[in-house]
């Protein structure tokens, strides 16, 4: 029950986190005009990963996309890439985790398969969260660097424009959304990984067991070795038991009533 709860909570937390990462990536307020020097401006500038906007006190807002790829700073491109990778990994992780949920029955899927899928989605969520946190942090670092540049004409690091000292940019709402969302996705991923441990079926370590098979005498001796059935060299019936280790044959064949004690 605790495993199901942990898995379900991990899924929900990751879902919220990924939704937040998507929201942050789409938001225009990654950087906003610093109003410290001019708190009474009638024109407010803010910028996102995809476009820059100007809101006038009249209420009119004008946004212009960055219609160039090559003209954009490498750092901005890197942030875009990190956020997109985070979204893609997160989306795949969500898809995988839906099928991995213990409360959802899909055919005759074994717990071991669900455990593997839970672990996979958990790792994907962790990487997705790290990508988002890294992307937001790189952008924040870029802003801090630009903020303290006091040259009369400085490069904004966004949109390829020349910026005067007049307009400085500070952290926008999207950065905080991104950090929180990345953190949630990371936490969700960790929870999925924890849930995976509880989902994995505990393998029995066969050491010294003996039983009578119908019509045939089968003896299992300690250690990992082949047990003869008296039917000559029929390799299909040869098994190796050593703490759960299996031959390729066993993986391929369906278990019979004699395969397990």
């Amino acid at each position: 029950m605790a495993v199901t709860a942990c898995q379900g909570l991990g899924f929900v937390v990751s879902l919220i986190g990924i939704a937040g990462i998507i929201a942050a990536t789409c938001m225009d307020q990654w950087s906003t005009q610093d109003l410290y020097n001019n708190p009474v401006t009638a024109v407010f500038n803010y910028q996102g990963l995809w476009r820059s906007c100007v809101r006038e006190s009249s209420g009119f807002t004008e946004c212009r996309g960055y219609f160039t790829l090559l003209g954009l700073p490498a750092m901005l491109q890197a942030v875009r890439a990190l956020m997109i990778v985070g979204i893609v990994l997160g989306a795949i992780g969500l898809l995988v985790s839906i099928f991995a949920l213990k409360c959802i029955r899909i055919g005759s899927m074994e717990d071991s398969a669900k455990a593997n899928m839970t672990l996979t989605s958990g790792i994907m969520f962790i990487v997705s969260g790290l990508c988002a946190i890294a992307g937001v942090s790189v952008f924040a670092n870029m802003l801090v660097t630009n903020f303290w540049m006091s040259t009369a004409n400085m490069y904004t690091g966004m949109g390829g424009m020349v910026q005067t000292v007049q307009t400085r940019y500070t952290f926008g709402a999207a950065l905080f959304v991104g950090w929180v969302a990345g953190g949630l996705t990371l936490i969700g991923g960790v929870m999925m990984c924890i849930a995976c441990r509880g989902l994995a079926p505990e393998e029995t370590n066969y050491k010294a067991v003996s039983y009578h098979a119908s019509g045939h005498s089968v003896a299992y001796k300690p250690g990992g070795f082949k047990a003869s059935t008296g039917f000559g060299s029929n390799t299909k019936n040869k098994k190796i038991y050593d703490g759960g280790a299996r031959t390729e044959d066993e993986v391929q064949s369906y278990p019979s009533k004699h395969d397990y004690v």
Partner: antibody, heavy 119, light 113 residues
């Protein structure tokens, strides 16, 4: 058609108070910032104050700061300018105007109301 | 506060001739975000309310005759009437709409010579 109609002007003694009103129609009043601009007899235009659409931002000219109070009643489509401690230099025609256009430009203006401060 | 200085104070121009009004700002009115200058020009005819002519320093408001044009960037701006008409007799004002207080220039009176 956009219309701005000012009222409340008149003769007042120095140190007195007056409340100007501006009734707006023909546009979504609650969506736009509003301004008061005045013009003393034979003089140029002087910007007085501004209030944002939701009253979140209010700015005043240094000459009226602390004496004038700007407010708006969006459901009533009305802008108000409460003028206290009036001085002779406040004598002017007071216009209300709206930043209805791009570039913070004052696109629509009322006909103005005259305020005379004299003893 | 932004101080706008208009020159000349008055201007007498013959009909059909060019009239040029200057407006100098104490601070840059150029906004990096959208590469626009936040300066507006108004026309006030005798006994009338001001009328918007030009916004963003050079964008003519729809309905304004094309003989009116605005130019300039940063701190220096110009309003030009390419061919003065009788109905253009008025006082012209520039206004800072970049930061509060939204100051006006002193005005330039345009008359016919």
């Amino acid at each position: 058609d956009v219309q701005l109609v000012e009222s409340g002007g008149g003769l007042v003694q120095p140190g007195g108070s007056l409340r100007l009103s501006c009734a707006a129609s023909g546009f979504t009043f609650s969506s736009f910032g509003m301004h008061w601009v005045r013009q003393a007899p034979g003089k140029g235009l002087e910007w007085v104050a501004y209030i944002s659409s939701g009253s979140g931002s209010i700015y005043y000219a240094d000459t009226v700061k602390g004496r004038f109070t700007l407010s708006r009643d969006n459901p009533k489509n009305t802008l108000y300018l409460q003028m206290n401690s009036l001085r002779a230099e406040d004598t002017a025609v007071y216009y209300c105007a709206t930043s209805y256009y791009y570039g913070n430009a004052l696109e629509y203006w009322g006909q103005g109301t005259t305020v005379t401060v004299s003893s | 506060d932004v101080v706008l200085t208009q020159s000349p104070d008055s201007l007498a121009v013959s009909l059909g001739e060019r009239a040029t009004i200057n407006c100098k700002s104490s601070q840059s009115l150029f906004n990096v975000g959208n590469q626009k200058n936040y300066l507006t020009w108004y026309q006030q005819k005798p006994g009338q309310t001001p009328k918007l002519l030009i916004y963003w320093a050079s964008t003519r408001k729809s309905g304004v005759p094309d003989r009116f044009s605005g130019s300039g960037s940063g701190t220096d701006f110009t309003l030009t009437i390419s061919s003065l008409q009788a109905e253009d007799v008025a006082v012209y004002y520039c206004q800072n709409v970049y930061s509060y207080p939204l100051t006006f220039g002193g005005g330039t009176k345009v008359e016919i010579k």
